[in-house]
C-alpha cells in the first residue's frame, strides 16, 4: 500500500530573469527513492537517479541547474516558463508518487512564494 | 569501452527451455536496468523483459508472461533470460541493452538467434 | 498498453534529401520517445533519446521533436550511410512498445 505524502512548494511566482528553486519531499513512507524525474507539462527536464546521478536534458542544460538535493534549480526565467511541474518519484517497493508545482513567471518586481501544500 | 555479449541461443523443440546470458563489461553493471528486446526474421524490435539495477523489480511483455524469467547476477555482472514452454513465435534473435535511468536503451549486444522448431 | 504507429513504413530519397518519419503514440507519452536506426544484420543503435536529445556520437543532421502523442524524426541531409530501418520507442509505461520501423531506401 502506498502511504507516502508528497509535499511541495505549491505556487510560487517569481520575477522574469530570475531563479527559481522547485522542490519536493517524500514523507510518510519508508520507501526507497530510486529515481526522481522532474517535467514541465510535456517535457522532461531533469532525472536523478539514486546510482547514476543527474541527467539534464540537452536542450534545458543552459537554464537548468542540478539540486539543491533532489530539487531542480531554474535559472534565466521567462514568462514562457510559467505552467506547472512535476516531481515523479520512482521508489521500491510502493511505486510511483507525483507532486505538482505551479510556478508564475512575471514582468514586474511583485513576486511572493505560494504556501506549502501537500498531494496524497 | 561499453560491452554486451550475448550467448545461449541456438535450435529447441517447442516447449523446450533455452537460457539466455548477456555478459556486461566496461560500466557499472550494477547501477544500470538491463532489457531483453527480439527481432522475429523479417520483423520489427518487440520488448521482451526488463529488471532494475538491483534486480528487485522485473517486467514483462504479455506474450512471455509465465514463461520467461528475467534477473541478473551483479557479482558476475551478466543478464539472463530463462525460456521456458518455447514456441515457434518465440524465433528471433534475442538482444540485451543497457538502460541508463530506466527510460533509453543505450547500447545493445550483436543479439542471439534463438529458433524454436520441431 | 501503448500503440506507437509510424509513418511511413518505407520511403525513397537521395543523399542530400531533407526526411522525416513520424511517430504517434496511443495516448500522451510527455516526452519518453526515443529513436533508433538499425541496419541489416546489425542491433539497433540509439539516435535520440527523450524526444529530442541526441544521444552523444550521433551527428547533428539527425533531430527529434514533438511531445504528448505526435514525434517527428528528421534527418536534414542525407548520408549514404544513413539507409537503413528506423524505430520509434515508448519508455512512458511498460510494456514497453516500439513502432513498426520506417526502412529509408536510396532512390
Known amino acids: 500500500m502506498m502511504t507516502g505524502t508528497i509535499e511541495t512548494t505549491g505556487n510560487i511566482s517569481a520575477e522574469k530573469g530570475g531563479s527559481i528553486i522547485l522542490q519536493c519531499h517524500l514523507s510518510s513512507t519508508t520507501a526507497q527513492v530510486t529515481q526522481v524525474n522532474w517535467e514541465q507539462q510535456d517535457q522532461l527536464l531533469a532525472i536523478c537517479n539514486a546510482d547514476l546521478g543527474w541527467h539534464i536534458s540537452p536542450s534545458f542544460k543552459d537554464r537548468v541547474a542540478p539540486g539543491p538535493g533532489l530539487g531542480l534549480t531554474l535559472q534565466s526565467l521567462t514568462v514562457n516558463d510559467t505552467g506547472e511541474y512535476f516531481c515523479i518519484y520512482h521508489t521500491y517497493p510502493d511505486g510511483t508518487y507525483t507532486g505538482r508545482i505551479f510556478l508564475e513567471v512575471l514582468e514586474s518586481s511583485v513576486a511572493e512564494h505560494g504556501a506549502r501544500f501537500q498531494i496524497p | 569501452e561499453v560491452q554486451l555479449l550475448e550467448s545461449g541461443g541456438g535450435l529447441v523443440q517447442p516447449g523446450g527451455s533455452l537460457r539466455l546470458s548477456c555478459a556486461a563489461s566496461g560500466f557499472t553493471f550494477s547501477s544500470y536496468a538491463m532489457s531483453w528486446v527480439r527481432q522475429a526474421p523479417g520483423k520489427g524490435l518487440e520488448w521482451v523483459s526488463a529488471?532494475?539495477?538491483?534486480?528487485?523489480?522485473?517486467y514483462y511483455a504479455d506474450s512471455v508472461k509465465g514463461r520467461f524469467t528475467i534477473s541478473r547476477d551483479n557479482s558476475k555482472n551478466t543478464l539472463y533470460l530463462q525460456m521456458n514452454s518455447l514456441r515457434a513465435e518465440d524465433t528471433a534473435v534475442y538482444y540485451c541493452?543497457?538502460?541508463?535511468?530506466?527510460?533509453?536503451?543505450?547500447?545493445w549486444g550483436q543479439g542471439t538467434l534463438v529458433t524454436v522448431s520441431s | 498498453d501503448i500503440q506507437m504507429t509510424q509513418s511511413p513504413s518505407s520511403l525513397s530519397a537521395s543523399v542530400g534529401d531533407r526526411v522525416t518519419i513520424t511517430c504517434r503514440a496511443s495516448?500522451?507519452?510527455?516526452?519518453?520517445l526515443n529513436w533508433y536506426q538499425q541496419k541489416p544484420g546489425k542491433a539497433p543503435k540509439l539516435l535520440i533519446y527523450?524526444?529530442?536529445s541526441l544521444q552523444s556520437g550521433v551527428p547533428s543532421r539527425f533531430s527529434g521533436s514533438g511531445s504528448g502523442t505526435d514525434f517527428t524524426l528528421t534527418i536534414s541531409s542525407l548520408q549514404p550511410e544513413d539507409f537503413a530501418t528506423y524505430y520509434c520507442?515508448?519508455?512512458?509505461?511498460?510494456?514497453?512498445?516500439f513502432g513498426g520501423g520506417t526502412k529509408v531506401e536510396i532512390k
Open positions: 527523450a524526444a529530442s
Open positions: 541493452a543497457r538502460e541508463p535511468y530506466d527510460y533509453w536503451m543505450d547500447y
Open positions: 520507442q515508448q519508455s512512458y509505461s511498460t510494456p514497453l512498445t
Open positions: 529488471i532494475s539495477g538491483s534486480g528487485g523489480s522485473t
Open positions: 495516448q500522451s507519452i510527455s516526452s519518453y
